[in-house]
């Protein structure tokens, strides 16, 4: 029997015995196409596939639809894994989404959604979320029901404006909504009263731009 050498997510890697956090190669479902991802093998039991990370403003998140589709940045630092991969991954299996947040005052919080998936590109990678728990707000800062994804060159929001151009970054904008984790990065002491910052309203309120964010997914049956 041939040994399995491809992994669809970090949970499979963890279960294979590779339990050190770091960059791993994942393979698209039913394909040979590959993507590099950061696997968090320490947080809450391990096996987390990181799909987004912000920490220092070193990567420009005001990107095109194609770039958000395919992914950009470095898995060792700030990056976006890619909407197409996440859509394919989450459409074939039930995943949970954990969003880890840090503010500039040394506090941390998280939001955990018990079911997360993205529709395909034909539905603009619409986000679907249910079952919110966690410490980053009792109400979802990602608008419910889920919105289509928008970028600076693909406006799919419900606003008379173009949210992605106004707030910067690609996101599941409503009109424009209570969150944008892909907004402009602002340093400490310059991070309040911002119209286009890294926002998670139901934890830190309006205009507060966060220090660090991580979005990660894991199979619900892990």
């Amino acid at each position: 029997k041939e040994e399995k050498t491809t992994f669809r997510d970090c949970a499979e890697i963890f279960k294979s015995g590779l339990t050190t956090s770091g960059i791993y190669t994942l393979t698209f479902p039913n394909s040979t196409e590959e993507v590099k991802a950061y696997c968090d093998m320490d947080m809450g039991g391990g096996g987390w596939t990181v799909i987004q990370h912000r920490e220092d403003g070193s990567v420009d998140f005001q990107r095109t639809w194609k770039e958000y589709k395919e992914g950009f940045g470095s898995p060792l630092g700030e990056y976006w894994l890619g909407n197409e991969f996440v859509s394919q991954l989450t459409s074939g299996h039930r995943y949970v989404l954990k969003i880890q947040l840090k503010d500039w005052e040394g506090s941390e919080a998280h939001s955990l959604y018990e079911h997360f998936y993205l529709s395909g590109e034909e539905s603009n990678y619409r986000i679907h979320l249910t079952g919110l728990t966690g410490t980053a707000g009792k109400i979802s800062s990602i608008s419910q029901p889920g919105s289509d994804f928008s970028t600076k060159d693909s406006d799919n929001d419900k606003c008379i404006c173009k949210c992605s151009q106004m707030l910067t970054g690609g996101w599941w904008f409503d009109a424009c909504g209570p969150s944008n984790l892909n907004g402009q990065y602002y340093p400490q002491k310059q991070n309040t009263n911002k119209f286009n910052g890294i926002k998670w309203y139901y934890w830190k309120g309006s205009g507060y731009s966060l220090k660090a964010t991580t979005m990660m997914i894991r199979p619900a049956d892990f």
């Epitope: 419900k158 606003c159 008379i160 404006c161 949210c163 106004m166 409503d174 009109a175 424009c176 909504g177 209570p178 009263n193 911002k194 119209f195 910052g197 926002k199 309203y201 309006s206 205009g207």
Partner: nanobody, 129 residues
Framework: DVQLVESGGGLVQPGGSLRLSCAVS????????IGWFRQAPGKEREGVSA????????YYADSVKGRFTISSDNSKNTVYLQMNSLRPEDTAVYYC??????????????????????WGQGTLVTVSS
């Protein structure tokens, strides 16, 4: 940087009047809507009134209609809230906040509180005899 500074709060008897001011810097009122919000002890922050200077549109919460009047002076980059016939239940910290005027949902006239990204520090209004 965007700054909003409220002033004009104080102690007033029931039935009295106050005029609050919101001095705005770092943005021009033509491109933004300015809202007044209030928060009483132990209660959620709630919208009171708002104005879009560019179109002259105004909004009032039902609880203040006919008693409060919002206005703006674009030359001074200042928004005012004239509060008449004040009641004890109007006691709260009053905040002004700004939102880009275009950040509107199709078919809607006004903005949810989470769209206001720039806030002042607030001014206390106490209505008591």
């Amino acid at each position: 940087d965007v700054q909003l500074v409220e002033s004009g709060g104080g102690l007033v008897q029931p039935g009295g009047s106050l005029r609050l001011s919101c001095a705005v810097s770092g943005i021009t009122l033509d491109d933004y809507a300015i809202g007044w919000f209030r928060q009483a002890p132990g209660k959620e922050r709630e919208g009171v009134s708002a104005i879009r200077s560019s179109g002259g549109s105004t909004y009032y919460a039902d609880s203040v209609k006919g008693r409060f009047t919002i206005s703006s002076d674009n030359s001074k980059n200042t928004v005012y809230l004239q509060m008449n016939s004040l009641r004890p239940e109007d006691t709260a910290v009053y905040y002004c906040a700004a939102v880009p005027a275009g950040r509107l949902r199709y078919g809607e006239q006004w903005y949810p509180i989470y769209e206001y990204d720039a806030w002042g520090q607030g001014t206390l209004v106490t209505v008591s005899s």
